[in-house]
Each structure stands twice: as structure tokens, then as C-alpha cells.
């Protein structure tokens, strides 16, 4: 019946590795939309919402030209590392009120681990040293608030959802040119 | 009403350059990338590039790289898009269109932009 | 670049008529329980029109006669029962790699 859903399957082509990255990060983002839309019908917020733990957006106007395989993934691999610990840290500290999109944000942090496993049997194929992220992992500390934790999961969502936007395009971009 | 407005009719000269713009309405303008479209008579759909207004960050169709550059004025929700170095298979209707972030499927569409390359 | 063949380039019924257009993809276009293939409408002079999305999800707004099927490289387009409105253009659009490609078009007519 084909290996289990968890397991990669065995592959020398490259393309065939990172259509598999792919799918598996288009399928995260429609994940994190869902979770985010549900997040604002629930818990409505108005503009942006930032985390200064959480990483910069990696994309920028002009670089998506000039992205080269080894960058972006090792790029993808520490961001979505960030976000995994965050989502976390969201699921530990969360109030009463997030309690309610707690097997939805345990979905996503599962689906997230999967995606990181993936990333890095596709850098130890395509033989790219595993780098370690710039910067020690700052511990997060409480939020202030119910309001605050509610803040952080709009912010966590919001920037996951652009970061993986950002892969999808990355990715095929790159496997245009191999 | 979510709807994106684009601006009007152009003539240009081989050679010259041409700016559409599309302004969204609607919706959180940065929730979603935008793409061009381009419709040239008798000539399938085709796809130029897409813009994801948050960050700014373009990619393009092979075919329309070097010609084709995608913008965002995320304070006013418009994109553009410019075409140079026209030619006369540069005439057709440009398509603006709201797409899935990631799946590239187009759920909302500008009314189009009619450009006209001729000498 | 993956290229989508749509037959037939046009098609005659009459109103209350089942409408079967076809999309055929130069690979697949399907991987692990996702299809990459997307169906519009186009009337002259008009916009095209989002009807399905990722082969089978009816867009909002869209009426029910509608329906997608298909993976792999094959996919269609049904309208159960015709409506005086329906005769337009159809075009598929696959968007499994870059760059997203689109069909040549099935023109449906008034028998």
C-alpha cells in the first residue's frame, strides 16, 4: 500500500524530493489559513500584530529572483524551527480562551515537525550542511494577558502563513530551474 | 464588495512602455498575492507573474522576465504592473486576479486593461 | 511548462442538456490526494469567472449544476442541467508547478 504517510518515500531525483517539501508546505498553508481565518471569526483583531521573536519575513521585493536551492532551504528550515517553538510556546501558555483551537494548533505543530523532518532529509540529500539557526533560541516568556496570547497566536498565524507562501513560490521556482 | 478596479485603455508604440494598475477593494489587500493575466486575441490565457503585496516580493513566467515588472502601493491596495519594450503581440487584455496565497488559483479578477501596440 | 488540452473546442446544446468538457494535462497534475486543476468561465467581453478550484471545490456563489471531477491527467467540467446563462467559454488552469498554465478553451453554443 505504499509507505506510511510520516515516512519520505526513497528518491535520487531532486525534483521528485522537493515536489514532495511542497506538497507538504501547500498543505501546511492551507492548514494555517484555516486556523487563521478561524482565529478571526472567533477572536476578531483589528491590523497588524507582531512578535519580536519571531522571524523577518524572508521574502522581499527583487529576492525571489536571485533565490539559489541551498538558501532557501536552509533559510525555510531555521524560520519554520522559530515558528514550531512558537506554536508551542502558544500551546503551553495559551489562556482558557485559545483552549478552544487547542486540536488545531496541536494539527499544525504535528504537520509542522513533518515539514522540518522533511527539509532536512531533502539538505542531507542534496548534501547541505544542516546549519544551525544565527542565534540561541530566546526563551519566550508569558504573555502579559489572555488578550496577549490572543495578540502572539493572530501575529504566529499571520507570519507562518506568509513565510509558507513564500516557500511554495521559492520551491517551485527553484525546481523550474534544475 | 470584494472588486478590483484597473484603469483604463492604452495605445502604445513598438518599443514604448505601458503601466496598468489595479486597485483592490474588499478584502485585506495583503492577505492575498496578486496575479497577471494576459489575453491576447485568439491566444490562450496566459499567466505573467504574481505579487505578494505584504512583502513586495514578485516572480514571473520565464517567458515575461526582463519585460514585465510587478509593484504594490500596499497604502493605497494597488498593484501595477509594466510591460517594456512592446510589440505588436504585446496587444491584447491584461488581466489583474486575486490568488490563493500558494495554490495559484484566481478567485476575484480585474475588468481588464486593453493595450493596443501598434506603429 | 505543462500543457492542458481541452476537447471539444466547441460544443452545441439546447437548454436542460448535460455538458461534459473535458481537460487533459501533458503530466500529472494530481499528487497525494490534491488536484492542481481549476475550471472558469468566460463570456465576451467579460472577466473569466472562477467556478472550481482544485478539481473539485465549487467556488462560492456558484450554482450546484456545476461540478468538477477527475485526477491524474484527466479532468471534466459537468453541468447537469444547461441554463440560457451557461453558454459562454470554459478554460481549465492547472497550477501543480510555475508557471500556472490554462487550456485552449471549450466554447459551449445554443443548439
Known amino acids: 500500500p505504499g509507505p506510511p504517510a510520516g515516512s519520505p518515500r526513497v528518491s535520487s531525483d531532486p525534483r521528485a524530493d522537493l515536489d514532495s517539501a511542497v506538497l507538504l508546505t501547500r498543505s501546511l498553508l492551507a492548514d494555517t489559513r484555516q486556523l487563521a481565518a478561524q482565529m478571526r471569526d472567533k477572536f476578531p483583531a483589528d491590523g497588524d500584530h507582531n512578535l519580536d521573536s519571531l522571524p523577518t519575513l524572508a521574502m522581499s521585493a527583487g529576492t525571489l529572483g536571485s533565490l539559489q536551492l541551498p538558501g532557501v532551504l536552509t533559510r525555510l528550515r531555521v524560520d519554520l524551527m522559530s515558528y514550531f517553538r512558537h506554536v508551542q510556546w502558544l500551546r503551553r501558555a495559551a489562556g482558557p480562551s485559545l483552549k478552544t483551537l487547542e486540536p488545531e494548533l496541536g494539527a499544525l505543530q504535528a504537520r509542522l515537525e513533518r515539514l522540518l523532518r522533511r527539509l532536512q532529509l531533502l539538505m542531507s540529500r542534496l548534501a547541505l550542511p544542516q546549519a544551525a539557526p544565527d542565534q540561541p533560541a530566546v526563551p519566550l516568556g508569558p504573555p502579559a494577558s489572555a488578550w496577549g496570547s490572543i495578540r502572539a497566536a493572530h501575529a504566529i498565524l499571520g507570519g507562518l502563513h506568509l513565510t509558507l507562501d513564500w516557500a511554495v513560490r521559492g520551491l517551485l521556482l527553484l525546481k523550474t530551474r534544475l | 464588495e470584494v472588486q478590483l478596479v484597473q484603469s483604463g485603455a492604452e495605445v502604445k508604440k513598438p518599443g514604448a512602455s505601458v503601466k496598468i494598475s489595479c486597485k483592490a477593494s474588499g478584502y485585506t489587500f495583503t492577505d492575498y498575492n496578486m496575479d497577471w493575466v494576459k489575453q491576447a486575441p485568439g491566444q490562450r490565457l496566459e499567466w505573467i507573474g504574481d505579487i505578494n503585496p505584504h512583502s513586495g516580493g514578485p516572480i514571473y513566467n520565464q517567458k515575461f522576465t526582463g519585460r514585465a515588472t510587478l509593484t504594490v502601493d500596499k497604502s493605497a491596495s494597488t498593484a501595477y504592473m509594466e510591460l517594456s519594450s512592446l510589440r505588436s503581440e504585446d496587444t491584447a487584455v491584461y488581466y489583474c486576479?486575486?490568488?490563493?496565497?500558494?495554490?495559484?488559483?484566481?478567485?476575484?479578477w480585474g475588468q481588464g486593461t486593453t493595450v493596443t501596440v501598434s506603429s | 511548462d505543462i500543457v492542458l488540452t481541452q476537447s471539444p473546442a466547441s460544443l452545441a446544446l439546447s437548454p436542460g442538456e448535460r455538458a461534459t468538457l473535458s481537460c487533459r494535462a501533458s503530466k500529472s497534475v494530481s499528487t497525494s490526494g490534491y488536484s492542481y486543476i481549476h475550471w472558469y468561465q468566460q463570456k465576451p467581453g467579460q472577466a473569466p469567472r472562477l467556478l472550481i478550484y482544485l478539481a473539485s471545490n465549487l467556488e462560492s456563489g456558484v450554482p450546484a449544476r456545476f461540478s468538477g471531477s477527475g485526477s491524474g491527467t484527466d479532468f471534466t467540467l459537468t453541468i447537469s442541467s444547461l441554463e440560457e446563462e451557461d453558454f459562454a467559454t470554459y478554460y481549465c488552469?492547472?497550477?501543480?508547478?510555475?508557471?500556472?498554465?490554462f487550456g485552449q478553451g471549450t466554447k459551449l453554443e445554443i443548439k
Open positions: 486576479a486575486r490568488g490563493e496565497l500558494g495554490h495559484w488559483y484566481f478567485d476575484v
Open positions: 488552469q492547472h497550477s501543480r508547478d510555475l508557471p500556472p498554465t
